[in-house]
């Protein structure tokens, strides 16, 4: 049998007992479960309001999910001696609404960070780079998971949410080694123009379940290592020649385009031609038209140029109201 990917650990855990004694380096914090054998600490669904100070030095995998952290300040995980082994940090669903600059400083081995399902009204531009230098020390992050971090409308800052996230991703060019970036379910209307150029090592990019209408101003040209591009469940109407050429030019990419409201008019002709000959689109036989009404549910691969027409635009003198 095959298995979908997962990252759960089945090692035994020791429930922590609260202690009046000063914490030992390898003691388990109150309200957490620890397994030294699995190098894992789980402080899950405990309504914690701050990161435990007494995390054991052996911790490699830290789960702080389902809490009430609210704010992650600078140096939230800085310890003496540092948590030098910490490689995977999961903070999903912990009611974070603010992640400040330098929140993840002094974690030299941090490879995977999951901030999903937190309504981030404020994400500092220096959350991942740790400093406001134009070129920062490279972050060790390889996987950054930011699904559903969009705050409710009434909690949004004045600037665009897309811009706020983009600023954090490009600051100091710190994330040049990032291989995986998940940005699904964030109501993105657009992808800021220069973000991908600053993430040249990306292999996996998930932008699914957003509200992207167009990729016209997005350049994938730099992403020569990209293996998976997920664009399912957006608001894409057509992919134009420039985008098609860039995607075709990426040597290893697989593109996922399911569940977009494709508009099958004369502007779709180039994309249909490309779909028929490309090997990069996964499940391309499932792509169907959403508009115009007469084309609804037609399979894109089965269309020919005669099917793809645009209603002529009448000169103003002949238009009727």
């Amino acid at each position: 049998t095959s298995s979908a990917s997962s990252s759960s650990s089945s090692a035994p855990f020791l429930a922590s007992a609260a202690s009046a004694q000063p914490p030992l380096p390898d003691q388990c914090p109150a309200l957490c479960e620890c397994s030294e054998a699995a190098r894992t600490v789980k402080c899950v669904n405990r309504n914690l309001t701050e990161v435990p100070t007494d995390l054991p030095l052996y911790v490699r995998n830290l789960f702080l999910t389902g809490n009430q952290l609210a704010v992650l300040p600078a140096g939230a995980f800085a310890r003496r001696p540092p948590l030098a082994e910490l490689a995977a940090l999961n903070l999903s669903g912990s009611r974070l609404d603010e992640v400040r600059g330098g929140a993840f400083e002094h974690l030299p081995s941090l490879r995977q960070l999951d901030l999903s399902h937190n309504p981030l009204a404020y994400l500092s531009p220096f959350a991942f780079s740790g400093s406001n230098a134009s070129i920062s020390a490279p972050s060790p992050l390889v996987e950054l998971i930011l699904n559903h971090i969009v705050p409710p409308d009434d909690k949004r800052q004045n600037r665009s949410f897309e811009g706020m996230v983009a600023a954090a991703l490009v600051a100091g060019r710190a994330l040049q080694g990032l291989h995986l970036l998940e940005l699904a379910s964030n109501h993105f209307l657009y992808l800021p123009r220069d973000v991908l150029a600053q993430l040249p090592s990306l292999r996996y990019l998930d932008l699914s379940n957003n509200s992207l209408v167009s990729l016209t101003y997005v350049s994938f040209r730099n992403l020569t290592h990209l293996e998976s591009l997920h664009l399912e469940d957006n608001a894409l109407k057509v992919l134009h020649n420039g985008t098609l050429a860039e995607l075709q030019g990426l040597p290893h990419v697989r593109v996922f385009l399911d569940n977009n409201p494709w508009v099958c008019d004369c502007h779709m002709a180039d994309m249909v031609t490309w779909l028929k000959q490309t090997g990069v689109v996964q499940g391309k036989d499932r792509l169907t038209c959403a508009f115009p009404e007469k084309m609804r549910n037609r399979v894109l691969l089965e269309l020919n140029s005669a099917d793809l027409d645009c209603d002529p635009i009448l000169p103003p003198s002949l238009q009727t109201s």
């Epitope: 699904a184 697989r254 990069v280 499940g283 391309k284």
Partner: nanobody, 120 residues
Framework: EVQLVESGGGLVQPGGSLRLSCAAS????????MSWYRQAPGKERELVAS????????RYADSVKGRFTISRDNAKNTLYLQMNSLRAEDTAVYYC?????????????WGQGTLVTVSS
């Protein structure tokens, strides 16, 4: 239910050959690119080779170029990896992979793996 079942692994001497197979079911095999990955003891899983839907395009890790060949038979729903001139450093568990959708939705499928040991 998506299933990927690898076979063909075993013990082989340096310089020898093996052919791995991956039988796929539960999805439209011909509509998806497929990959082989491997994981050696104490190392991270790495991409070995991948092939597009109709087999028109293939890619290989630098370490196996010229020695390994990936292919597919869409009529048989089977993915292959022909491994020639095997070296000790090719020793690993080899996995077949089908990515049918976002990883976060559990749509990145893996077989159970087949062990390849290259040793004299």
């Amino acid at each position: 239910e998506v299933q990927l079942v690898e076979s063909g692994g075993g013990l082989v001497q340096p310089g020898g050959s093996l052919r791995l197979s991956c039988a796929a079911s539960g999805f439209t095999f011909s509509s998806y690119a497929m990959s082989w990955y491997r994981q050696a003891p104490g190392k991270e899983r790495e991409l070995v080779a991948s092939i597009t839907t109709a087999g028109g395009s293939t890619r290989y890790a630098d370490s196996v170029k010229g020695r390994f060949t990936i292919s597919r038979d869409n009529a048989k729903n089977t993915l292959y990896l022909q491994m020639n001139s095997l070296r000790a450093e090719d020793t690993a568990v080899y996995y077949c992979n089908a990515e049918l959708g976002p990883r976060r939705l559990g749509m990145d499928y893996w077989g159970q793996g087949t062990l390849v040991t290259v040793s004299s």
